[in-house]
Every structure is written in C-alpha cells, then in structure tokens.
Interface confidence: medium
C-alpha cells in the first residue's frame, strides 16, 4: 500500500480543507490576528512540511453570524 508522506498540496489540499472546514470556507493565509508566524500560509505549512487536522482547522473561515 502507498505510504502517505503526510503533506498536502494542490487539489488534495483543497479537498481535505473542505472535509475539515465543512464547507464553511477557508483561507490560504490566516488573518494576521490569528497567526503567530505571520509570513507562513497553508501551502508552506502543509505542502512544504507535514501538518495535522488541528493546524488545518486554523485555516477554516469563521463567517459572520449565521442566519
């Protein structure tokens, strides 16, 4: 069986973000107020190195109050 590298790029990254964020949308770079390493975006954190579900979740959008 294929051994996963634990990195996410391209379409796989988008697909997994849709799973983690549940269709509420996501950012490729978090708003400055939510990020400690301001220069990094999700591609650098999850495509160039490995990341987990908790880190992916920090890129989910938090829309204005729902209907």
């Amino acid at each position: 069986a294929y051994r996963p590298s634990e990195t996410l790029c391209g379409g796989e990254l988008v697909d997994t973000l849709q799973f983690v964020c549940g269709d509420r949308g996501f950012y490729f770079s978090r708003p400055a107020s939510r990020v400690s390493r301001r220069s990094r975006g999700i591609v650098e954190e999850c495509c160039f190195r490995s990341c987990d579900l908790a880190l992916l979740e920090t890129y989910c959008a938090t829309p204005a109050k729902s209907e």
Partner: antibody, heavy 115, light 105 residues
Framework: QVELVESGGGLVQPGGSLRLSCAAS????????MSWVRQAPGKGLEWVSY????????GYADSVKGRFTISRDNSKNTLYLQMNSLRAEDTAVYYC????????WGQGTLVTVSS | DIVLTQPPSVSGAPGQRVTISCTGS????????VHWYQQLPGTAPKLLIY???KRPSGVPDRFSGSKSGTSASLAITGLQSEDEADYYC?????FGGGTKLTVLG
C-alpha cells in the same frame, strides 16, 4: 453502481492487531478521499480516520491516534485500516465511507476485541 | 470539542409529519453545513440530506432538511413504515448521537 465492500473483521484479544480492507468499484477511486467510521454495538456513529484521494494525507480521531493507520492502494482500488494495540472499546462495526460527505458506505465488518 | 445533540427518539403515525432536531452552537452548526444519514435496522448508514437541505438522487422529496442559527432539522412528511430507522446529523467528521424514529401502528 458504487460499491464498497469491507473485510478483515473478526475476534481478537486485547492488545492484538487486525487489518481491515475496503474494496471499491463503480467510481473513479483515485478521485475521492475515504474515511473509516465505526459503530459500537447499540451505539452511534464515530468517525475514525480519513485519507486524501492520492493518499498523501491522513487524519485520525483522538481515540485511535497512534494505534491505527489508514492507507490506500490506488492500483488496487482498496482502502486499509491497520489496527494495533486493540482495546475492548474498539469493538464495533467498521464502515468505509466515500468522499468528504460520506455519500456511499460499505456494509461494514465487525471487529470484536475480547479475551 | 464539537457536540451535536439529537433527541434519542421520536415517533409518529403513518401519514404524519415528524421533525428531528440537531442542536449545536454558533461555532459549529452556525458555520458548518449539516448532513443527515438514515440507518435502517441492520444496514449501513445512507446519506439522506447533504449541505443542510440538498437531497441525493433517489431520496424521496418527503425528506427535507433546514438550518437556522444553532439548530438543524430533518423533516419527514407522509410518514411510512419503511421510514422506521435511526437518523444521524453530522458536520464534517462529527456525528450527533442519533435519533430512533418509530412509526406507530
């Protein structure tokens, strides 16, 4: 039509190991992420693990992290779940489910962990 | 952690309308899409409603879903005996506790 068929369940002692398989047909296998979801006897559904469509990424529920490993073989259209250090609370029917919305499910395979 | 709360059971007579609620908080149901699954006795779950209110092909229009604020609902009209099953709501990888629907009579 879409078909998912799980196998590999059975009776195993606490601390033992088991590998589940899920054979897929009827859709473009390598285009879909897959998950394992389990259901303890008489209980509700619990998501266990996720793997992205190329197999590059995996995610796990806290209850199985470090003990279970999900993988896929895109040349065989098959999903796997390697379960180690099994506990009594892992006793459940294990289902494989397609995609990010779990739009198709297999029939399930029963895993019983008991001495 | 995300928690989704469903009533353990609901019941109705054939032909009636029943609703099943799924309650969370503004940080989950308020922002995520909700999916519903039907599990007939002794069978695997089946996707019934996705993205709050959309029906997969083959699901009768007697089944409908809605979402408002921190709660989602599944409505079944024209209740039939074959609707007797367990129903689960979910958002992403978290499931509600399930609701057993009993069709009376």
């Amino acid at each position: 039509q879409v078909e998912l068929v799980e196998s590999g369940g059975g009776l195993v002692q606490p601390g033992g190991s088991l590998r589940l398989s899920c054979a897929a047909s009827g859709f473009t296998w390598s285009s879909f992420a897959m998950s394992w979801v389990r259901q303890a006897p008489g209980k509700g559904l619990e998501w266990v693990s996720y793997i992205s469509y190329l197999g590059s990424y995996t995610g796990y529920a806290d209850s199985v992290k470090g003990r279970f490993t999900i993988s896929r073989d895109n040349s065989k259209n098959t999903l796997y779940l390697q379960m180690n250090s099994l506990r009594a609370e892992d006793t459940a029917v294990y289902y494989c489910a397609r995609g990010t919305k779990f739009d198709y499910w297999g029939q399930g395979t029963l895993v019983t962990v008991s001495s | 952690d995300i928690v989704l709360t469903q009533p353990p059971s609901v019941s109705g007579a054939p032909g009636q309308r029943v609703t099943i609620s799924c309650t969370g908080s503004s940080s989950n149901i308020g922002t995520y899409d909700v999916h519903w699954y039907q599990q007939l006795p002794g069978t695997a779950p089946k996707l019934l409603i996705y993205s709050n209110s959309k029906r997969p092909s083959g699901v009768p229009d007697r089944f409908s879903g809605s979402k408002s604020g921190t709660s989602a609902s599944l409505a079944i009209t024209g209740l039939q005996s074959e609707d007797e099953a367990d129903y689960y709501c979910s958002i992403t990888r978290v499931f509600g506790g399930g609701t057993k629907l009993t069709v009376l009579g």
